[in-house]
């Protein structure tokens, strides 16, 4: 806190400009209208500023709203943004996919830190559901940022928001939040045609039930092995080795690889080893 | 429910054999989902798997233990045993058998049961 | 195969402490992970499986994170009962290795 004390003759601020940077922390406090200050936030962003300094005009700002900042304010944070801890941003309702950009934008290259992870929340609890614009937005500034949802709150995902997914933005997701999304991608992948709708949903068959592989297998697809990794055991296990073939086509000789490994061991454990030597790689049940 | 319980002698003697039997009752060792193993902890130590079986009698050995190892599993008696060969006192542990279900991991284990290896 | 490392060895908390185990893979075991705790004189127990699931039964103030090469066993609110020896364990590569343990002590 910094005392209040009255501002020196000739020092009161008529305008946010690079003048206050040399203002000790008690003048900008006594000298800097914090209604001045929350109309040009916009200008405190290209004056260098102090830590210190910063921390007075957050200060201004907690004071003239207590019950959180408006969005006006908000959006022009900038650095300031730094500042703010998860109990501030929870007192704020920003509903602007511009305000959140923006503010993401200050914390860019960095991982996502309590702050960002809180207004995150806020914006997707606000909107009531993960749109395709906020899901593009989130997945651009954090490419693991669905998989760092539950299954509930990913079951917020409208099948449309599917279309912004990229591969990578799954990559870090367990079997429980693939379960909630491949449903969806498979709704809104169904209007395309057999080798299209393959590459759509590749990413998401992590989530995908033993008849849906079944499916897939009599379609030519030649699934990699990456993705074949990346099966749930409970669905693989029931394939037979003539559909694992037909699922993997030329790839099928990675098995031998990845024979050490979750699912393919536990697969080839429960083939007749008649059916394994079919396919000439020295597998063992 | 499904229960495991050990059974062998307590003591072994250096470069001899040891061997243990794990019981299964209440469920199949012939199950789908199920592969069954030993595991091991010295006392005052850490776990240390030596091992699993498949119904089918396909086995994995932990490569430390491999050349010494042999599992075996009767389905008539619905029983899985143990054989760890040349045993020395490093040997001494409580040994644990362990139904390891597919989908979970380790979910039902034996009360274990202490192998002393001493002349 | 895959080595698990876990730390810390071991640690004291209070009753009503959370509590933050970790465990280090060698290499990627992706989201298979285990974790088990032991009491003494008795047999591990089954915590989480696949690195996140709550194994039937346990108290849901045990939760696990992670993929890859870095996992964690949370215990949000310790309780009395919670006072023993953690473990964690990879079943994706066929060594099925465990960690060196965790023992939670009473402060």
């Known amino acids: 806190e910094v005392e209040k004390t009255a501002c020196p003759s000739g020092k009161k601020a008529r305008e946010i400009d690079e003048s206050l940077i040399f203002y000790k922390k008690w003048e900008l406090e006594a000298c800097v209208d914090a209604a001045l200050l929350a109309t040009q936030m916009d200008r405190v962003n290209a004056i260098p500023f102090t830590y210190e300094q910063l921390d007075v005009l957050k200060h201004k700002l907690d004071e003239l709203y207590p019950q959180g900042y408006p969005e006006s304010v908000i959006q022009h944070l900038g650095y300031l943004f730094l500042k703010m801890s998860p109990e501030d941003i929870r007192k704020w309702n920003v509903t602007s996919l511009e305000t959140l950009k923006a503010l993401l934008e200050v914390n860019k290259g960095h991982e996502m830190s309590p702050q960002v992870a809180t207004l995150i929340d806020r914006f997707v609890k606000g909107r009531g559901q993960l749109d395709k614009d906020t899901l593009d937005t989130l997945t651009a500034f954090y490419p693991g940022y669905l998989c760092s949802l539950s299954p509930e709150e990913l079951s917020s995902v409208p099948p449309s928001s599917i279309w912004a997914v990229r591969p990578q933005d799954l990559d870090t997701c367990d079997p429980r939040q693939l379960d909630v999304l491949y449903p969806k991608a498979r709704l809104a992948f169904q209007n395309m045609n057999g080798s299209e709708y393959f590459v759509k949903i590749q990413s998401f068959l992590g989530g995908a039930p033993t008849e849906d592989l079944k499916a897939l297998s009599q379609q030519n697809v030649s699934m990699d092995l990456a993705t074949f990794m990346k099966l749930r055991t409970d669905a693989v296990l029931p394939l037979t080795v003539a559909e694992v073939q037909k699922l993997l086509g030329p790839h099928v000789e990675g098995l031998k690889a990845e024979e050490r490994h979750r699912p393919v061991r536990d697969w080839i454990l429960r083939q007749r080893q008649d059916d394994l030597d079919t396919l000439g790689l020295g597998l063992q049940g | 429910q499904v229960q495991l319980q050990e059974s062998g002698p307590g003591l072994v003697k250096p470069s001899e054999t040891l061997s243990l039997t794990c019981t299964v009752s209440g469920g199949s060792v012939s199950s789908f989902t199920d592969t069954w193993s030993w595991i091991r902890q010295p006392p005052g130590k850490g776990l240390e798997w030596i091992g699993y079986i498949y119904y089918s009698g396909s086995t994995n050995y932990n490569p430390s233990l491999k050349s010494r190892v042999t599992i075996s599993v009767d389905t008539s008696k619905n029983q899985f045993s143990l054989k760890l060969s040349s045993v020395t006192a490093a040997d001494t542990a409580v040994y644990y058998c362990?139904?390891?279900?597919?989908?979970?991991?380790?979910?039902?284990w034996g009360q274990g049961t202490m192998v002393t290896v001493s002349s | 195969d895959i080595q698990m490392t876990q730390s810390p060895s071991s640690l004291s908390a209070s009753v009503g402490d959370r509590v933050t185990i970790t465990c280090r893979a060698s290499q990627s075991s992706r989201y298979y992970v285990n974790w088990y705790q032991q009491k003494p004189g008795k047999a591990p127990k089954l915590l989480i499986y696949a690195a996140s699931s709550l194994q039937s039964g346990v108290p849901s103030r045990f939760s696990g994170s992670g993929s890859g090469t870095d996992f964690t066993l949370t215990i949000s609110s310790l309780q009395p009962e919670d006072f023993a020896t953690y473990y964690c364990q990879q079943p994706y590569d066929a060594s099925y290795t465990f960690g060196g343990g965790t023992k939670v002590e009473i402060k």
């Open positions: 362990a139904r390891d279900n597919v989908f979970t991991g380790f979910d039902i």
